[in-house]
């Protein structure tokens, strides 16, 4: 049994880091493998992660952490029984994938303005809380070409757009994702999408 692709890990910078790797053949990850991880910190103890299958030869493990600060560094040991297959380290602050925003809501009752709001996925005491920026994706269910991205570079988790920038009388969907420039993170996953029917009063033409 050998490791074909070494573990790579990403952290949500809160409580979970996810490590993925591939073995050289079909593997029952949960029964055959264990990933031991330990914070490089005086008196800390090792923890064991039981991996799950992620495709025939792929494994994934979700490492639980109390919290994360920038100086944290973890040792990682991948074991198959008594055999050490791989040894490495992981610094969560250098491999951050933020949590996805939640509770995306479209408010359509504000005079021909669409107000989209969502929730910051971090608590106020987390460093990323004040460092997220967002991308909002809006698309038409009827017309695949009607697909747009709005970059929200301010901290407030909201976006206002004129309803008239979208077509009237059809349904749209929206979703939002986040990233943090300070840690050069990857983008989060997209939030669940929300749907609304876009309608607004066309202005009367003057003749």
């Amino acid at each position: 049994m050998k490791v074909l692709q070494e573990p790579t890990c990403v952290s949500d910078y809160m409580s979970i880091s996810t490590c993925e790797w591939k073995m050289n053949g079909p593997t029952n990850c949960s029964t055959e493998l264990r990933l031991l991880y330990q914070l490089v910190f005086l008196l800390s103890e090792a923890h064991t992660c039981i991996p799950e299958n992620n495709g025939g030869a792929g494994c994934v493990c979700h490492l639980l952490m109390d919290d994360v600060v920038s100086a944290d560094n973890y040792t990682l040991d991948l074991w198959a029984g008594q055999q050490l297959l791989w040894k490495g380290s992981f610094k969560p602050s250098e491999h951050v994938k933020p949590r996805a925003p939640g509770n995306l809501t479209v408010h359509t009752n504000v005079s021909d303005t669409l107000l989209l709001t969502w929730s910051n996925p971090y608590p106020p005491d987390n460093y990323l809380y004040n460092h997220l920026t967002y991308a909002v994706n809006i698309w038409s269910e009827n017309d695949p070409a009607d697909f747009r991205i709005y970059n929200v570079t301010y901290l407030e988790p909201s976006l206002r757009i004129a309803a008239s920038t979208l077509k009237s009388g059809i349904s749209y969907r929206a979703r939002v994702r986040a990233w943090a420039q300070c840690y050069n993170t990857t983008w989060s996953e997209w939030s669940p999408s929300t749907k609304w029917h876009n309608s607004y009063r066309e202005p009367f033409e003057q003749h």
């Epitope: 910190f41 005086l42 800390s44 600060v69």
Partner: nanobody, 115 residues
Amino acid sequence: QVQLVESGGGLVQPGGSLRLSCAASGDFYCMAWFRQAPGKEREAVATIRSGGRSTYYADSVKGRFTISRDNSKNTVYLQMNSLKAEDTAVYYCAVGVDGNCRNYWGQGTLVTVSS
């Protein structure tokens, strides 16, 4: 120059309690308490990470000692309960920029547990 100022040591009866404190002139990733009993090597007793949520203890003090820190004051505390004669030692505060926690040391404060 980093300074660590310890206080709170003294004489206490077995089963009693003491609270040690250590004020640091700076913010550190790791803050710790070590102890050295007469004729023995210095050993780590408890450590705490920046942010103060993660704490770690030597087996010999688990359930009896509690480490905490006040980040606004750069101060670390060690609450010692149910003290035993074998806890008698000079207790040292130490801080570190990494998880080794040994960059700077305090001068030590003597804790004597005796009836």
